[in-house]
Amino acid sequence: ELCDDDPPKITHATFKAVAYKEGTMLNCECKRGFRRIKSGSPYMLCTGNSSHSSWDNQCQCTSSAARNTTKQVTPQPEEQKERKTTEMQSQMQLADQVSLPGHCREPPPWENEATERIYHFVVGQTVYYQCVQGYRALHRGPAESVCKMTHGKTRWTQPQLICTGETEPSQFPGEEEPQASPDGLPESETSR
């Protein structure tokens, strides 16, 4: 079942999943000036069985230059800033190492995809938190959150992490060195 809400937000931290449970949706979103093609699903889906899982549907973006755009839309302040164009897979070596039954790896990038990936997780999904560049992790427990079903409602457990001070970013499970990105994880590898 889909989790109703997004994972908790931790100040000065980002999160990512190491692998994605079957049923997870990844919205097919495109960067500015592009839009998803009309044919095909509006999202990719992690699907399969216990022995093999993969992403169903392929996201495709097409130029919207020749299309009519709606003038009444006023951009939000944060959208007026120039967004960094991080190469999606440059820092996802970890996802390539995992092969959990009933889970999908990080999907490969598609041309002109949005800089932020929007996932919709399912019950049982775990996401891992990491402090952004310049902040140090104070752990009171696991720096992770799990989507659980309680009394018919979904909820995310609270990660036991505080990010404070000036130091190198902490690491996700299994990573050898801190991330090189000036902002810790690229935006595209977090979810909202």
Epitope: S39, G40, S41, T47, T69, T70, Q72, V73, E79, I118
Partner: antibody
């Protein structure tokens, strides 16, 4: 929690226009496509079109081109559908809905009558 | 446009029974099908996405299956609150289209 709150019922004259609103909350409005659906008894559900508020991109069902105009105001997280040159055929309940994951507004009843 | 056909407009069942609502697409839509439940005077509520995955809060007595052109929504152990109309929808190609609906009546 995702919520889509639509404007109230409308009773309008034939030949006029109407603008229905849909205020979104509980998610990032600019990141999701938002669709509009028409429901008439005996005619089922019809997809009118959808809009991506983050860029203002729109898709229209050919059947509703020239009839419906979709817009969005990101500052208020509100989507709008304007229906023009109204006739009795436009009398229906209109829903706004986030495309995926699906979540629907409560509907707006439109009656076109002289 | 892709046509979604729900051949049974009405289905009658009893509490505790198992009922299957079917939907046929006029062409292959993969698993890009959703199922909705609409109770009288309410807006449609999403039950199933991608043919077989339940939305949160949807009781596990609702099960979706199928791919390609034939899809089924099965309600096992029917409850009185399941009295509603059920619609299928394809979102494989634009415009997204809906089935005509199947009204479930409880005997």
């Amino acid at each position: 929690q995702v919520q889509l709150q639509q404007s109230g019922a409308e009773l309008v004259r034939p030949g006029t226009s109407v603008k229905i609103s849909c205020k979104a909350s509980g998610y990032t409005f600019t990141n999701y496509w938002l669709g509009w659906i028409k429901q008439r008894p005996g005619h089922g559900l019809e997809w009118i079109g959808d809009i991506y508020p983050g860029g203002g991109y729109t898709n229209y069902n050919e059947k509703f081109k020239g009839k419906a105009t979709l817009t969005a105001d990101t500052s208020s997280s509100t989507a709008y559908m304007q229906l023009s040159s109204l006739t009795s055929e436009d009398s229906a309940v209109y829903f706004c809905a986030r495309v995926t994951p699906a979540s629907w507004g409560q509907g707006t009843s439109l009656t076109v009558s002289s | 446009d892709i046509q979604m056909t729900q051949s049974q407009k009405f289905m009658s069942t009893s509490v505790g029974d198992r009922v299957s609502v079917t939907c046929k697409a006029s062409q292959n839509v993969g698993t890009n099908v959703a199922w909705y439940q609409q109770k009288p005077g309410q807006s449609p509520k999403a039950l199933i996405y991608s043919a077989s995955y339940r939305y949160s809060g949807v009781p596990d007595r609702f099960t979706g299956s199928g791919s390609g052109t034939d899809f089924t929504l099965t309600i096992s152990n029917v409850q009185s609150e399941d009295l509603a109309e059920y619609f299928c929808q394809q979102y494989n190609s634009y415009p997204y289209t809906f089935g005509g609906g199947t009204k479930l009546e409880i005997k």
